[in-house]
């Protein structure tokens, strides 16, 4: 008896992070013994879609000619050979940005700050959302990842960073999305650009704890003028 | 592209009521906010309030509280303006507006009321 | 209500020169909690709807040429055509963005000299 059929690679071109309108290409790459592939997309009804194999067999391709909102999610994919269905590929998440009008980003007290003080990027979405995503260009992840442990909606979150060392400086973007899809994201901020001067050496970027802000009323300022001491949103590392 | 198709001219009798439609496309419609700006004829621009298609929040000038209604239509993209007793003054040429941070970065073409015994 | 209020009422310029046009606010647009200016500006041509120019009282809208820029903070704001061409004969607007209602100035008149 042979063993399970191995894992097919599924991957997106040209990216999983993929505008609004934007196309998209999903692609399931498994072995030549494939008669079919099967794209499966987390809570929706299995298969998502199905393809015959591009030759020589072993790869199929799922097009989305027009991203948006119900294209967004978690995908996996499997093919068919004349022994029976291999097993799931890993998955593939595909996040969509411009689900939301872009937050303001702003750097506090100042984006020019001195080695070995501290800074604080502020990150503000227009409509309440409970995560916020902050991302430094050239970075292969987010650089943090602030979640509402309550499914709080706030209109900010705080990325402190202390003390600051040459390692922070470069251009930062943040992200807001809400709890309900964390597949769908804002567009991304205007770039903010942090200059570090001084010679002070640390290695490692030290991140503090986060806050986060409700917006005030109607009447009162459309964002916060002051900030809330407790944090209802939690830090993660990506 | 992202644009902002609005109804066309309306002529109204004083004290009825007018209702404008403004169709978006080339964005995700649900997230972000569609405001209402008046502005009569060679004059300047006066907010009404904003709708937020993803839940149909909405606000309004407590000038206009009362006699502007504001709806959205998630099937087709469209949000819709009513504004009932219809007097002279409210003679203009009414703006949808998408909300980028409270301020509008894209507007629809304008729709004309003219209130006219 | 924060009020909003734009000088000159009209302005002409020459071709290739300045133009210059002020805001005023009733009470401060600078929010301490992000140290940004809660203020937009607009062009307006005659029977188009408006344009938005500037936003937080100095960053250009994407595609605006970089002949227009804003300046200012607090309750005086300023924007600054540097070269005047002839497409940019229209009406501008500033709009606070600070709090509800959101407010737009009078309006200021620009005319080629």
């Known amino acids: 008896q042979a063993g399970p059929l191995p894992k097919p690679t599924l991957w997106a071109e040209p990216g999983s992070v993929i505008s609004w309108g934007n196309s998209v290409t999903i692609w399931c790459q498994g072995t030549l013994e494939a008669r079919e592939y099967r794209l499966d997309k987390e809570e929706s009804p299995a298969p998502w879609d199905r393809q015959n194999p591009l030759e020589p067999k072993n790869k199929a391709r799922f097009s989305i000619p027009s991203m948006t909102e119900d294209y967004a999610g978690r995908y996996r994919c499997y093919y068919r050979s004349p022994v029976g269905w291999s097993q799931p590929s890993d998955p593939l998440e595909l996040v969509m940005t411009g689900a939301y009008s872009k937050p303001t980003l702003s750097a506090l007290p100042s984006p020019l700050v001195t080695s070995g003080k501290s800074v604080t990027l502020l990150c503000q979405s227009r409509s309440p959302m409970d995560t916020f995503l902050l991302i430094k260009e050239r970075a292969a992840h987010p650089l943090l990842h602030l979640r509402s442990e309550h499914g709080a909606q706030q209109h900010q979150a705080e990325f402190p960073m202390s003390p600051v060392t040459s390692v922070h400086g470069g251009t930062y973007r943040c992200f807001s999305s809400h709890g309900f899809s964390h597949y769908l994201l804002s567009h991304p901020s205007d770039p903010l650009e942090l200059i570090v001067s001084g010679s002070l050496e640390d290695p490692r970027p030290s991140p503090t704890r986060s806050v986060s802000t409700a917006a005030g009323p109607e009447d009162q300022p459309l964002m916060p003028t002051g900030s809330v001491p407790h944090s209802g949103l939690r830090r993660h590392w990506e | 592209e992202v644009q902002l198709v609005q109804s066309g001219a309306e002529v109204k009798k004083p004290g009825a009521s007018v209702k404008v439609s403004c169709k978006a496309s080339?964005?995700?419609?649900?997230?972000?906010?569609i405001d209402w700006v008046k502005q009569p004829p060679g004059k300047g621009l006066e907010w009404i309030g904003y709708?937020?298609?993803?839940?149909?929040?909405?606000s309004y000038n407590q000038k206009f509280k009362g006699r502007a209604t504001m709806t959205v239509d998630k099937s087709t993209s469209t949000v819709y303006m009513e504004l009932s007793s219809l007097r002279s003054e409210d003679t203009a040429v009414y703006y949808c507006?998408?909300?980028?941070?409270?301020?509008?970065?894209?507007w629809g073409q304008g729709t004309t009321v003219t209130v006219s015994s | 209500d924060i009020v909003m209020t734009q000088s000159p009422d009209s302005l002409a310029v020459s071709l290739g020169e300045r133009a210059t046009i002020n805001c005023k606010s009733s009470?401060?647009?600078?929010?301490?909690?992000?140290?940004?200016?809660?203020l937009a500006w607009y062009q307006q041509k005659p029977g188009q709807p408006p344009k938005l120019l500037i936003y937080?009282?100095?960053t250009r809208e994407s595609g605006v040429p970089d002949r227009f820029s804003g300046s200012g903070s607090g309750t005086d704001f300023t924007l600054t055509i540097s070269s005047l061409q002839a497409e940019d004969v229209a009406v501008y607007y500033c709009?606070?963005?600070?709090?509800?209602?959101?407010?737009f100035g009078q309006g200021t008149k620009l005319e080629i000299k």
């Open positions: 507006a998408r909300q980028a941070f409270y301020y509008f970065d894209y």
């Open positions: 080339g964005y995700s419609f649900s997230g972000f906010y």
């Open positions: 709708i937020f298609p993803s839940n149909g929040e909405t």
């Open positions: 009470q401060s647009l600078l929010s301490s909690s992000n140290q940004k200016n809660y």
């Open positions: 937080w009282a100095s």
């Open positions: 709009q606070q963005y600070y709090s509800y209602p959101l407010t």
